[in-house]
Every structure is written in structure tokens, then in C-alpha cells.
Interface confidence: low
Amino acid sequence: AITEAREEAKPYPLFPGPLPGSLQTDHTSLLSLPHTSGYQPALMFSPTQPGRPYTGNVAIPRVTSAGSKLLPPLAFKHTVGHIILSEHKDVKFNCSISVPNIYQDTTISWWKDGKELLGAHHAITQFYPDDEVTAIIASFSITSVQRSDNGSYICKMKINNEEIVSDPIYIEVQGLPHFTKQPESMNVTRNTAFNLTCQAVGPPEPVNIFWVQNSSRVNEQPEKSPSVLTVPGLTEMAVFSCEAHNDKGLTVSKGVQINIKAIPSPPTEVSIHNSTAHSILISWVPGFDGYSPFRNCSVQVKEVDPLSNGSVMIFNTSASPHMYQIKQLQALANYSIGVSCMNEIGWSAVSPWILASTTEGAPSVAPLNVTVFLNESRDNVDIRWMKPLTKRQAGELVGYRISHVWQSAGISKELLEEVGQNNSRAQISVQVHNATCTVRIAAVTKGGVGPFSDPVKIFIPAHGWVDHAPSSTPAPGNA
């Protein structure tokens, strides 16, 4: 059995007697230290039980320089095997060995969990020579131990290319429970079960877990770590934490808020960024997401016009970016715009509605009843039309654009004329005789030029040949 040296143990008396922590198994290794030695360990631990078999590596020297006398096997003396202490305490432990004086330049190194301890560690090696042997004590001290100091420590010494290894000294640093997994904040659906996990470790073990909801314990009996708490469902926000208990005391995890998912708050600050004749670019500031990510948003558009049927156009868009270009709108129209966004729970209320207007656009219909005839006496072409019939104007009519194309013997020439908005007739000079003139007319607003009417053709004869018959396009419904 391993003797546990607890921190309450009294320091082992150094003098007189054998080396501290040594195990006396044969009489050849007995050695008394000189009483004048200034060596005084800060904390020593009681020796292991006599008679314990030695399991470390042993170096067996062959002969002395004289070649006659056999030397005993070299081995570290047994020392305390297991040290248990609390975090932030100081500890000092050692290993010792008696080495015949024929060996020179012996060095002892310390190893922890298979790795050599180098650098800024408090390791001291002291030598106590006698007639035939030198007692070597290697001490290792740690101030304010931490959990990371837990592990198995050994001494190693090299002699004649042989390696001598001591028994391990197990350091166990005990303290309050240490969380390896704490509960995490969650957003959950109302009245839906969910799990929280808490895990803590010692030493010392075992670690027991209590769950706390809104400052009240959930479980009367503790659960061994790790613990999973299944919450059947919540109707309102709650704060959970877990308490981890061991023999040293208790540690409390961070409190985590469990939020209940709800529909989002409505967006705010709907703003107009750009208007054209048929589109409006808007942006908005999303409302609170109700503890559930936004999925998409809906832009709702109502035409503010006594003549409109009051229907709402709905445009669905992604939740991000918080921007949308509303298209396919009427020119020179007023609209009321609202935005609503949804998460997995449902749709928010609509944002405060804002007013926006589209700018003037080009007309959407062409002039009607385009009639063309030749006034040969004046050598010009007379054109007549009707104002485009439309339920609503795309903008204020500023005039008409007349396209007349003259085709003769493979040559084609297009000319454009502009006339004012009050005109419904125009005259254009004959450009070429013995040719075809094709006329089209479009309405014009500040927003642009509308579509051209269907082409009307008239043949312009050579001089002296008259045809007074007009050419025309019929009005809609009269064809």
C-alpha cells in the first residue's frame, strides 16, 4: 500500500538516523549525515512501510578500479509515494541515493509524467561525502501548488551510461471542484423540453451536482458529475446555474439565461433612399429578434389613391441586408410602405407605415388614331392623332415625338420632330418623292418617351400625281 502523506503530517525529524524518506533494506546503505549539515527541508513526509520491494531501475557496477571488490547495486532509496495537499500550499519532496566515491560527475534530473523538468523549477541537489560513499539528496519544491502540478515525479541519474530511476512520487493537488462543462445560455420554444449539462472534477472526487433555477435548488438529492438536467419546458425566462460540491467545498457555475423564443418586434426607422418612376429603395432597422434569428421579411406596399382598390402588394425578401428595392410600381404615385419580419415563431407586427412617392415616368401607352395624308399643294404630309387614353398619367405630358422614315430605292432616312403637348396634329415637309413615308408617334413626359404608335405608311408619288386618300391606324376597338 502507498502511504499517503497528508498536509497535516508533522515534518519528519531529520537527525539522527537514516536519510529522510529512505527505506532501509540492507545494512550496506546505512549512512548517517554529519550533524553540521545546514540542510533542512521545508516539509518532509513519513517513509513508506519497511519491506516494500524495490521496483526502480538498478545499476550494477562491475568492479572497483583495483578489479577485486564487488560493489552493491546502485538504487534510489525509497521515499514517500503519494502526497496529497490543497491548492496554493507549498510542497517539498526529495529522492536520495548513496553513490560510491569512484563515480565522478553524477547529476540528478527531475521528470514529471515522462517529461524532463527544465528551467525555472526549484530543484536543489546536495552532496554529503563520506569515506567510501557520497549521499546525494535531490530536493524539489513547489510554491503555491496548482492543479497543473498534479502528476508523477521521478528522479533520474546517469552513471556509466546506465540510467537509474527512482520510484514515482505522486502529487495530488486537491481543491474546490473545477468545471469542465458549464451550462450554456439557450433560446428555447415555450413549453418545450430542453437539456442543460454540468460537469466538474476534483480531486478530491466524487463531485456532486445541484441544479439551481432562479436562485432555488431544483434537485433535493445531488447527482454525481456529470449531470444532465432535463427541463420539461418554460413559460418565461429563467436563470439556471449548477453547484459542484466535493470534500473541499463548493463551486458555483456561471448563471445562464434561458430565453423564451417569441415573435420579433416590428422593424423601426423605415427610410427611403432612392425613388425612380417605377421603383423605391427602402431600408429599415430590424426590431428585436425575439431570441430567434430572422428568416425573412415582407415589404407591404399600399397605393395611397382614392381611385385604387386598396389592395396591398407584398414583396418577400431575405432578412439581411435590411434593404429592398420595390419594383413594378406606377409612376407618379403615392405609396404607403410597411415592413414586417419573421422568425421561426412567426411574423412581427408591421413597422410604422411611411409615405413615399415615385417620380415621373415615361408614358406607357401610345397616341391613338394616327392618320397621315399628303397635302400635295403644300408639298407636306399632314399627321393627326388622339391623345393617349390612360387611366392615369405617368407624368405631365410635355409633348409628342414624331418619327418619320423615308424609304426610296433602297435608301432609308429617319427624322424626328417634337411638338407641344397641346397639339394633336402636325405637318412635315416631304423629304423625297416617289418614296414611302412611315410615321410613328410617341407621347413624351419629363420621365421620358413612351412607346411609339403602330407605323402608318403613305406613298409619296412623283410630282403631279395626287392621291388624297389618307392612311391611318384605327382606334382600339374600332378595328
Epitope: 426607422e269 427611403i272 432612392n274 431600408s283 441586408p321 435590411h322
Partner: antibody, heavy 121, light 107 residues
């Protein structure tokens, strides 16, 4: 650390085309919501917004100057460019480029030091 | 275009005083207004955005408010380093427009 630096010709003659470059560091125009704009400041007229380009290559111009302005970017080189065609003496000003981060709100949080332009025959 | 009017061209104040710089928008712009400070020989720096939110690193003696389309930048306990030009800007719609600026002089 976000920095912007404007560069330009300094002096131009009327009817020439002004080419400005904004070189920036500390952010990328590949990032969602990022944008860079141009603003000019003339001694008599205060600050005037000229144009803005967004991460997704959306461009917006001041309508009063739109026919003369062209904004563009080279994302890989962290540069934004502005061209103003057919300059005249009223274009004499200090030209700033500035950054908008995150889309909304649309305010310029970092500005360059400005590059002066004098248009003179 | 939305016109931002800063009627006070120059304001004179003393260290420790409280002063209000005003800006009026010609149309509704919501809270989409930012205030910039421009010290002599420097480029503008954002002070207050969305009408009342201080930009990071701006001392809390700078505050912003609005009433309808009237926007106010208030500097309480004026310091000598506050000598600068102050501009408002709306970003409710394109084109973004600036006020003409108010120059703060320290007596």
C-alpha cells in the same frame, strides 16, 4: 487600424477629366455592408456629397453631377476611383474619400486627409 | 434634394459654457442625421450619429437631440479643443446632403 488616402493631379485645366484614387487599409470592400464615398469641400460652398460605391458594386451619384461622375473600385487592390469629366473652375476643392461600415446607419466613420484640386487655365 | 440648414454661421462661447448648434431638414429624415466636427486643417470626424448616439471615443459632453426636423448638437462644458466647424448631414435619402457648417469660436 483603418486609414484612407486620396491622390489626384493637384492642378487641371478646364475641360480636362479629373481622376482620383482612394487607397485604403484596415478594411475590405469584400465585406458585407462596407462602402466608400467621395465628398468635396470648397471654401465657399461647404461639403458636397458626390458619389458612393457599395461592397456589392451598387453605385449612387449626386444627381446634380451624375452625367460627369464615374465611381469604380478595385477590391483586390483596396482602391476606389472617381472620375469627373469636363472640369471647370467650380470644381476647385479638396476631395475626400470616406468609409461607411455596416450599411446602416449611413454615416462616414473614417475620412482621408483630402487631396486638393485647383482648376485653372 | 433634402436641404440641411445651419442658420448660425459663427457662434462665440467661453470655456466651461454650454452651447447648442442647430440644423433644420427641409423634409422628414427620421433620426438619420450625423454631426461631424472639423478642426482647422483636418478632415471631418463623426461625433454623433442617428441623431443622438455618440461615436466611440467622443466625450460625453457632446449630445444630440431632435424635435421633428430640427436637430441640435449640444456641447456642455465647452473646452478650448472644441474650437472647430460643426456640420450636420442627413443620410435618409440620396443624395446625402450636408449643412453649411457652424464655426465655434472660443472667446
Amino acid at each position: 487600424q483603418v486609414t484612407l488616402r486620396e491622390s489626384g493631379p493637384g492642378i487641371l485645366q478646364p475641360s480636362q477629366t479629373l481622376s482620383l484614387t482612394c487607397s485604403f487599409s484596415g478594411f475590405s470592400l469584400n465585406t458585407f455592408g462596407m462602402g466608400v464615398g467621395w465628398i468635396r469641400q470648397s471654401s465657399g460652398k461647404g461639403l458636397k456629397w458626390l458619389a458612393h460605391i457599395w461592397w456589392d458594386d451598387d453605385k449612387f451619384y449626386n444627381p446634380a453631377l451624375k452625367s460627369r461622375l464615374t465611381i469604380s473600385k478595385d477590391t483586390s487592390k483596396n482602391q476606389v476611383f472617381l472620375k469627373i469629366a469636363n472640369v471647370d473652375t467650380t470644381d476647385t476643392a479638396t476631395y475626400y474619400c470616406a468609409r461607411i461600415e455596416g450599411g446602416l446607419p449611413y454615416y462616414y466613420d473614417y475620412w482621408g486627409q483630402g487631396t486638393p484640386l485647383i482648376v485653372s487655365s | 434634394d433634402i436641404v440641411m440648414t445651419q442658420s448660425q454661421k459663427i457662434m462665440s462661447t467661453s470655456v466651461g459654457d454650454r452651447i447648442s448648434v442647430t440644423c433644420k431638414a427641409s423634409q422628414i429624415v427620421g433620426t438619420n442625421v450625423v454631426w461631424y466636427q472639423q478642426k482647422p486643417g483636418q478632415s471631418p470626424k463623426a461625433l454623433i450619429y442617428s441623431t443622438s448616439y455618440r461615436y466611440s471615443g467622443v466625450p460625453d459632453r457632446f449630445t444630440g437631440s431632435r424635435s421633428g426636423t430640427d436637430f441640435t448638437l449640444t456641447i456642455s462644458n465647452v473646452q478650448s479643443e472644441d474650437l472647430a466647424n460643426y456640420f450636420c448631414q442627413q443620410y435618409n435619402s440620396y443624395p446625402f446632403t450636408f449643412g453649411s457648417g457652424t464655426k465655434l469660436e472660443i472667446k
